[in-house]
Interface confidence: low
């Protein structure tokens, strides 16, 4: 599972798979807001 700042933001935005918040191998999220340090 992805639990970094990026992924928390994307999960809240509903961009991640809803099955346990796990990113599927063929899933490519939008590039908006991806984490930089």
């Amino acid at each position: 599972a992805c639990d970094t700042a990026t992924c928390v933001t994307h999960r809240l935005a509903g961009l991640l798979s809803r099955s346990g918040g796990v990113v599927k191998n063929n899933f490519v999220p939008t590039n908006v807001g991806s984490k930089a340090f």
């Epitope: 992805c2 970094t4 700042a5 990026t6 933001t9 990113v23 490519v28 908006v32 930089a36 340090f37």
Partner: antibody, heavy 122, light 107 residues
């Protein structure tokens, strides 16, 4: 003007302790996820620790190399970030940067301080 | 831990030329890759986030591409101030990791 100013670095003997501080100004500090990233002399970048925003319960994460020895914390009232470093080793010698991140949904903000040098040597 | 491997280690080019820097991840990281530029004695500077988004104020000559495990930073026409060390990083999994860096030097 946005600023992150690190302080607290210096020379310390192996096994000793130091507390680094990072003073933030010019942005809403409590909203930001903050990390410490270090760079040994002549080497690459290494992530050390992260503390989430106030709304994310200020949860923390650490690199394995520092887990149990370093503690990251924040004081949102003082717009300050800290790194308590105990049981220091020679391999902890590095410039330590604090870096702040906030996601607006359509864009991000990312700020870096200029770093503070920690030297662990006898 | 996700390992990022950058290549080449050193790239020697002249101003005006095109630079292509590679970053390969040991595991799938979707598009959670950022690129940083660092000059001697300075803090890193964010160039690209989300694999392909230019950060605020970054010139259009810098572009990023890739997804999954293979990522590229391209500088379309090198300016004298672009000669520096470039790092990729991933934020898909803890611990966050960086590549070892590519030094872009003047030929």
């Amino acid at each position: 003007e946005v600023q992150l100013v690190e302080s607290g670095g210096g020379l310390v003997q192996p096994g000793g302790s130091l507390r680094l501080s990072c003073a933030a100004s010019g942005f809403t500090f409590s909203n930001y996820w903050i990390s410490w990233v270090r760079q040994a002399p002549g080497k690459g970048l290494e992530w050390v620790a992260e503390i989430r925003s106030e709304s994310d319960a200020s949860a923390t994460h650490y690199a394995e190399a520092v887990k149990g020895r370093f503690t990251i914390s924040r004081d949102n009232a003082k717009n300050s970030l800290y790194l308590q470093m105990n049981s220091l080793r020679a391999e902890d010698t590095a410039v330590y940067y604090c870096t702040a991140y906030f996601d607006y949904g359509l864009a991000i903000q990312n700020y870096w301080g200029q770093g503070t040098l920690v030297t662990v040597s006898s | 831990e996700i390992v990022l491997t950058q290549s080449p280690a050193t790239l020697s080019l002249s101003p005006g030329e095109r630079a292509t820097l590679s970053c390969k991840a040991s595991k799938w990281v979707t598009t959670y890759v950022s690129w940083y530029q660092q000059k001697p004695g300075q803090a890193p500077r964010l160039l690209i986030y989300g694999a392909s988004n230019r950060y605020l104020g970054i010139p259009a000559r810098f572009s990023g591409s890739g997804s999954g495990t293979d990522f590229t930073l391209t500088i379309s026409s090198l300016e004298p101030e672009d000669f520096a060390v470039y790092y990729c990083s991933q934020s898909y999994n803890y611990p966050y990791t960086f590549g070892q860096g590519t030094k872009l030097e003047i030929k």
